[in-house]
């Protein structure tokens, strides 16, 4: 099924994400005690570290090309607040499209 196929993509994306976060932390002078939001892999896509008040935008992740190969990919955002990251806006399905009736094969 498509979800099983996505596992390999995710492992590769996650490894790339952790490298990206490390580089971004060095560039921005971020460490564990820095105010702001640490970079993270949320099991769907990669979010770079951000300062409080910053909005981070990402393109829809690769997973949704499997769900909807013909769909133009949208954009998802998270806000970095004093309490940490907000949840994605819009949620992934709303931003990236989801065909409820597409087969799983």
């Amino acid at each position: 099924g498509s979800m099983a196929h996505s596992d390999g993509i995710f492992k590769k994306e996650q490894a790339m994400c952790l490298e990206k976060i490390q580089r971004a932390n060095e560039l921005m002078g971020f460490n564990d005690s820095s105010p702001g939001c640490p970079g993270m892999w949320d099991n769907i896509t990669c979010w770079k570290p951000a300062h409080v008040g910053e909005m981070v935008l990402v393109s829809c992740p690769e997973l949704f090309r499997i769900f909807n190969p013909d769909q133009d990919m949208g954009v998802v955002s998270r806000n970095c607040t004093e309490d940490g990251w907000s949840e994605p806006f819009p949620h992934y399905f709303d931003a990236c499209g989801f065909d409820e009736y597409e087969s799983e094969t």
């Epitope: 949620h91 399905f93 989801f98």
Partner: antibody, heavy 120, light 107 residues
Framework: QVQLVESGGGVVQPGRSLRLSCAAS????????MHWVRQAPGKGLEWVAV????????YYAESVKGRFTISRDNSKNTLYLQMNSLRAEDTALFYC?????????????WGQGTLVTVSS | EIVLTQSPATLSLSPGERATLSCRAS??????LHWYQQKPGQAPRLLIK???QSLSGIPARFSGSGSGTDFTLTISSLEPEDFAVYYC?????????FGPGTKVDIK
């Protein structure tokens, strides 16, 4: 059509455990996040927990953290809520709901609920 | 956690009247605010998503507005089947939360 059927509710003594199940049909269960939401008799809705499509992300309300565990079996199209150290204030109708997302999302379809009564 | 406050707690109106329900968040939730209707003995039903987006199958008399901390659900002309409890729900910050509800009853 989307159908969610909860089971496993009942009367239980304080401090004991109970496991709720939610059988899903009418949609591709393995692609959606799932929520548990509860409603005490005559009261409002209280969000309890959510689990991502693959079970990799789980989040809980403060009131149940450390006592309740959300899980899923995608091969059986079933969502679970393991409830330990139950208290009188956990007495409620427990709804399972589909989250319109892979990660969390907002509940878009709901079951009819299963009643949990915690009483000595 | 983000606390949602709904007002009024009860709204007594007659069929045909306009209903205006308010939901206020203790911190900004952007537009990640959703509205549900619950009738006695039934599960909640999603009415409006992302503050103002309508859903297929939901009558056009239901509309939503707002962003940040202040939101409104409007029922333009109450039908007998609209008398119910209405809840707002935020999915902007974990843990997610619901408002305490507004009961719309018949005057």
């Amino acid at each position: 059509q989307v159908q969610l059927v909860e089971s496993g509710g009942g009367v239980v003594q304080p401090g004991r455990s109970l496991r709720l199940s939610c059988a899903a049909s009418g949609f591709t269960f393995s692609r959606f996040a799932m929520h548990w939401v509860r409603q005490a008799p005559g009261k409002g809705l209280e969000w309890v927990a959510v689990i991502s499509y693959d079970g990799g992300n789980k989040y809980y309300a403060e009131s149940v953290k450390g006592r309740f565990t959300i899980s899923r079996d995608n091969s059986k199209n079933t969502l679970y809520l393991q409830m330990n150290s139950l208290r009188a204030e956990d007495t409620a109708l427990f709804y399972c709901a589909r989250g319109y997302d892979v990660l969390t999302g907002y509940p878009d379809y709901w079951g009819q609920g299963t009643l949990v009564t915690v009483s000595s | 956690e983000i606390v949602l406050t709904q007002s009024p707690a009860t709204l007594s109106l007659s069929p045909g009247e306009r209903a205006t329900l308010s939901c206020r968040a203790s911190k900004s939730v952007g537009r990640s605010l959703h509205w549900y209707q619950q009738k006695p003995g039934q599960a909640p039903r999603l009415l409006i998503k992302y503050a103002s987006q309508s859903l297929s199958g939901i009558p056009a008399r239901f509309s939503g507005s707002g962003s940040g901390t202040d939101f409104t659900l409007t029922i333009s002309s109450l039908e007998p089947e609209d008398f119910a409890v209405y809840y707002c729900h935020q999915s902007s910050r974990l843990p997610f939360t619901f408002g305490p509800g507004t009961k719309v009853d018949i005057k």
